[in-house]
């Protein structure tokens, strides 16, 4: 049996930051789980991991240099990504794995979310002209 | 039996234009076919159509306002999209349908191509200071 995952089809990060909510057809309350976010059509880059355990505080980390935080709901995990670069525009897939209690469960591959990082395009300030001569 | 389609995982349109090549596991020579390009995770927008017929010239059109051209290879169709907007950054899927000879054939859904439209972000020129006074 597979968990189903819902994600927004597209999100735009105007200020180099975005909240991506992964909604699951499964209640994570009092479960040991690993929720992760993967970048690219081949899901090659693991962007962020949220590890949850009924007895411990939520642990959030990235092994790939992303600035990431996570928030847990009963049937969702929201990834908060900051300091994104324009060239990190890509498709991002939510993944969920339940390790305890058995049996191990994971999700059907989701459709993904296109994150379009618009960033801030800063133009150089014109040179300060200085005081005009009399 | 389904045709397999290969596309680049990602393309960046720096100058608001891009060539997207759809490669098929099928030879289109002397076939009547309809090759199309679809935008979005739900493929909701048909961006461009290339219609080919053994007896006629290739016909290329867009019903959705895209500036599009197409080029045919034996086992490929290349879509050339111009005048793309930054907010048209999305995932694009190639589709191929062979109408003649029977039987009708189409493709397994491809992985798609993320087209990241970077566009040209023009900064205003600094005001021309004019000649300095003696």
């Amino acid at each position: 049996n597979k968990i189903l995952v819902k994600q927004s089809p597209m999100l735009v990060a105007y200020d180099n930051a975005v909240n991506l909510s992964c909604k699951y057809s499964y209640n994570l309350f009092s479960r040991e789980f690993r929720a992760s976010l993967h970048k690219g059509l081949d899901s090659a880059v693991e962007v962020c991991v949220v590890y949850g355990n009924y007895s411990q505080q939520l642990q959030v980390y990235s092994k790939t240099g992303f600035n990431c935080d996570g928030k847990l709901g009963n049937e969702s995990v929201t990834f908060y990504l900051q300091n994104l670069y324009v060239n990190q525009t890509d498709i991002y897939f939510c993944k969920i794995e339940v390790m305890y209690p058995p049996p191990y469960l994971d999700n059907e591959k989701s459709n993904g979310t296109i994150i379009h990082v618009k960033g801030k395009h800063l133009c150089p300030s014109p040179l300060f002209p200085g005081p005009s001569k009399p | 039996n389904k045709i397999l389609v290969k596309q680049s995982p990602m393309l960046v349109a720096y100058d608001n234009a891009v060539n997207l090549s759809c490669k098929y596991s099928y030879n289109l020579f002397s076939r009547e076919f309809r090759a199309s390009l679809h935008k979005g995770l739900d493929s909701a927008v048909e961006v461009c159509v290339v219609y080919g017929n053994y007896s006629q010239q290739l016909q290329v059109y867009s019903k959705t306002g895209f500036n599009c051209d197409g080029k045919l290879g034996n086992e490929s169709v290349t879509f050339y999209l111009q005048n793309l907007y930054v907010n048209q950054t999305d995932i694009y899927f190639c589709k191929i349908e062979v109408m003649y000879p029977p039987p009708y054939l189409d493709n397994e859904k491809s992985n798609g191509t993320i087209i990241h439209v970077k566009g040209k972000h023009l900064c205003p020129s600094p005001l021309f200071p004019g000649p300095s006074k003696p």
Epitope: - | R34, N53, K63, M99, D106
Partner: antibody, heavy 120, light 107 residues
Framework: EVQLVESGGGLVQPGGSLRLSCAAS????????IHWVRQAPGKGLEWVAS????????RYADSVKGRFTISADTSKNTAYLQMNSLRAEDTAVYYC?????????????WGQGTTVTVSS | DIQMTQSPSSLSASVGDRVTITCHAS??????LNWYQQKPGKAPKLLIY???NLHTGVPSRFSGSGSGTDFTLTISSLQPEDFATYYC?????????FGGGTKVEIK
């Protein structure tokens, strides 16, 4: 010669059923959509349904969804419109027409039409 | 659904007159607009496709123009066989929709 010939029209009571046929000849059936377009007495044209015989993909107008079924038999080059739960407002001349699957935007060949009257 | 509005709904004209019929789409349909002629008791016939292209066998006195939301069918010099009802139809998005028709009558 390219031809579309409709048949199967007639008088039927409200709630009744009827099946219309459209026999195609003179062109490659799997290169075209087959459509049904109707015209109520003294009224304009209304697109009803379409089928692409190649992959049997169908579309319907909201006004007939769930009541009408379009189908096609490629061995006979014939399309059908099965009309169930007929209402007085379905009374019309029903035309069979085609549009090209690769170049789909206009109806270039029409049948002569078949009349459906729904009345008690 | 895209609404197609034709005007006028009817007009009276004489042989030799220049006749103009307009069609308005409720949203941008680019050039995906077709015109048909229908005579009483007969099936419609395609006249113009993609806004301005004359269908095979249609006399050159018929012409079409426009793009976006506003389109025009012009008959440059009305002939006796042109007295009929004319319909516009959008072919951009399903469901394909028709205008209400314009009946061209003899003055």
């Amino acid at each position: 010669e390219v031809q579309l010939v409709e048949s199967g029209g007639g008088l039927v009571q409200p709630g009744g059923s009827l099946r219309l046929s459209c026999a195609a000849s003179g062109f490659t059936f799997t290169s075209y959509y087959i459509h049904w377009v109707r015209q109520a007495p003294g009224k304009g044209l209304e697109w009803v349904a379409s089928i692409y015989p190649g992959n049997v993909a169908t579309r319907y107008a909201d006004s007939v969804k769930g009541r009408f079924t379009i189908s096609a038999d490629t061995s006979k080059n014939t399309a059908y419109l099965q009309m169930n739960s007929l209402r007085a407002e379905d009374t019309a001349v029903y035309y069979c027409t085609r549009s090209h699957y690769g170049l789909d935007w206009n109806f270039d060949v029409w049948g002569q039409g078949t009349t459906v009257t729904v009345s008690s | 659904d895209i609404q197609m509005t034709q005007s006028p709904s009817s007009l009276s004209a004489s042989v030799g007159d220049r006749v103009t019929i307009t069609c308005h789409a409720s949203q941008n349909i680019y050039v995906w607009l077709n015109w048909y002629q229908q005579k009483p008791g007969k099936a419609p016939k395609l006249l113009i496709y993609k806004a301005s292209n004359l269908h095979t066998g249609v006399p050159s006195r018929f012409s079409g123009s426009g793009s976006g939301t506003d389109f025009t069918l012009t008959i440059s010099s009305l002939q006796p066989e042109d007295f009929a009802t004319y319909y516009c139809q959008q072919g951009q998005t399903y469901p394909y929709t028709f205008g209400g028709g314009t009946k061209v009558e003899i003055k």
